[in-house]
Amino acid sequence: LEETLLNTKLETADLKWVTFPQVDGQWEELSGLDEEQHSVRTYEVCDVQRAPGQAHWLRTGWVPRRGAVHVYATLRFTMLECLSLPRAGRSCKETFTVFYYESDADTATALTPAWMENPYIKVDTVAAEHLTRKRPGAEATGKVNVKTLRLGPLSKAGFYLAFQDQGACMALLSLHLFYKKCAQLTVNLTRFPETVPRELVVPVAGSCVVDAVPAPGPSPSLYCREDGQWAEQPVTGCSCAPGFEAAEGNTKCRACAQGTFKPLSGEGSCQPCPANSHSNTIGSAVCQCRVGYFRARTDPRGAPCTTPPSAPRSVVSRLNGSSLHLEWSAPLESGGREDLTYALRCRECRPGGSCAPCGGDLTFDPGPRDLVEPWVVVRGLRPDFTYTFEVTALNGVSSLATGPVPFEPVNVTTDREVPPAVSDIRVTRSSPSSLSLAWAVPRAPSGAVLDYEVKYHEKGAEGPSSVRFLKTSENRAELRGLKRGASYLVQVRARSEAGYGPFGQEHHSQTQLDESEGWREQLA
């Protein structure tokens, strides 16, 4: 980037620069016409017959340097070819010399500083690349010369530029004084300010653009070179904050549009809101869940929103005495999550009708909650109780939802308790064809024993047709029509209002071989 200190092309009034000495043939200010056909102020000198060593000086006004250390001067000039000038002496030149003089204020006069090299500092002797020439019988032709010189290093508040002619026929068409600065640059979301280089290279600290944050590592910096160019080097720049994405060639951060989000700082663009979420404002780092949808505390900010599952389906119960096997089908709606578990709530109602949460005497296998498989075994059910089990499905966001948790209920009523198995069978009498048996009355929990059933068969005759039954209302029985000297296996069960109890253990008895032995009591 170039910052202009003086551009004669833009001057409309007379320049009124100072010339020395005040003699004929001196630099003269004239109107000229530039490439764009605009009128410009120019200086011309054409004293090609002067005495050797005589110089014509032209000095600009005082130019504040505005902090520049090196200033560039672009000269546009034309010069006549000495060969084309019939009256040109041997002193005719096709060069001129450029000087500068530094001062802290506009202190120069018509005579000071002395018009010589030192105090003036020589910049360069400028030769024309293109000469305007005229050949007899032809039009004069020529081109404009353009030369850029470098002044400095400068240290005072300002300076004058001076031109020394020693026998050229030339015109200074324009003078452009400028310094170079590194233009404000935004790269990798880092803004580097406009910088005037004070040395060959100057380190410049960058700052993050709006809505960007520094990347980890050293703070970003670039080097501004003396020629006004930023030195090419990778920048550990900044990155867009959450809710913003890089735009316009990584020069600014743009807020995520409605319906999109960006959860983290860094590279990457705004993404559409995940399922069941929305963002109603621009610049969202996270999308809000729709009503009824949630993110678990452990879910990433960019995860879809999920909802608690619906109730499990089709609970099937299989009652086996005091044990109950429950199994069910997975819910129709999982809520969009994989972390599905099941839990059971239980209420029990006594035969009399009073109900309460199930007591601690029930055991659940694998447990009453955090079930990952859709089944459970409940043990310790009490007879003649009605149990209500509510099976619920849960997931990682169930705890965030308000309102009732859907469940699938199942009611199970246990049987009233039958008498216990009859044991302690005794043979009170035996004969070759009969056996008299007696047993202790079992303690029936649900009312008195109504009657008994005796099941017996000859040992070794296992088929169903060989088994015989005998009902008795007393706690004794006589088995008749038995084989002589045979072994029999006997079982007894008691019946109450709740039904038959289980058969007791098989009791082994034997009939007599002959009558002579008579009836005799036997203890089982």
């Epitope: 003269e28 004239l30 109107s31 000229g32 016409l33 530039d34 490439e35 056909q37 120019t42 011309e44 054409c46 090609v48 034309t78 010069m79 006549l80 084309s84 000038l85 019939p86 009256r87 305007t132 005229k134 007899p136 019988g137 032809a138 039009e139 004069a140 032709t141 020529g142 404009v144 026929c169 030339m170 015109a171 068409l173």
Partner: antibody, heavy 126, light 109 residues
């Protein structure tokens, strides 16, 4: 402001020559083009030729080639136009005119003439 | 030789009128065309050079346009002091023979 002052009116015989002068006052002279233009009574303008004093040689319109000589004296900032073998149809007002820009200060070789002398009446009559 | 042809050779107009004079070159002269104004008994005065560049001090009611072979001088609102003869001239060919057009006389209607 530059002024071009021409010499006075002349009455000439056919076959003779006339030399008209044009003195420039104020500033640079050598690098401007000085043109000569004539205007016969009731007629239009007619360009005769021009000179850039620093170069010395002049350029002429084909019509006047061999009959007109244009010169310049840089030391006195004066240009001259001499027309020989005069004929009655050479009776005209003769103007000198200076170009708008010097040969060095224009990007284009414009010969547009923005400064004119007052004119010199040359009458050719026997 | 290059020929410069002006039209019309004369015209009558009133103060305030818009006046247009054309000039045609027999060859392409790019934009190297000048316009002059001359009043009786006076030297010509440069109005426009380079086809469209207004000479310093010339009123802005004068304007020029064109390039190549066809050029126009326009006076947007004729003033009493504008009644004069107008000449076009080419600046392009070397040596520039037949530099001037024959002139257009603008008279009061």
């Amino acid at each position: 402001q530059v002024q071009l002052v021409q010499s006075g009116a002349e009455v000439k015989k056919p076959g003779s020559s006339v030399k008209v002068s044009c003195k420039a006052s104020g500033g640079t002279f050598s690098t401007y083009a000085i043109s000569w233009v004539r205007q016969a009574p009731g007629q239009g303008l007619e360009w005769m030729g021009k000179i850039i004093p620093i170069f010395g040689d002049a350029d002429y319109a084909q019509k006047f080639q061999g009959r007109v000589t244009i010169t310049a004296d840089e030391s006195t900032s004066t240009a001259y136009m001499e027309l020989s073998s005069l004929r009655s149809e050479d009776t005209a007002v003769y103007y000198c005119a200076r170009s708008s820009y010097t040969i060095l200060t224009t990007y284009y070789n414009y010969n547009a003439m923005d400064n004119w002398g007052q004119g010199t009446l040359v009458t050719v009559s026997s | 030789d290059i020929q410069m042809t002006q039209s019309p050779s004369s015209l009558s107009a009133s103060v305030g009128d818009r006046v247009t004079i054309t000039c045609r070159a027999s060859q392409n002269i790019n934009n190297f065309l000048n316009w002059y104004q001359q009043k009786p008994g006076k030297a010509p005065k440069l109005l426009i050079y380079g086809s469209s560049i207004l000479q310093s001090g010339v009123p802005s009611r004068f304007s020029g346009s064109g390039s190549g072979t066809d050029f126009t001088l326009t006076i947007s609102s004729l003033q009493p002091e504008d009644f004069a003869t107008y000449y076009c001239s080419q600046d392009h060919f070397y040596p520039p023979s037949g530099t001037f057009g024959q002139g257009t006389k603008v008279e009061i209607k």
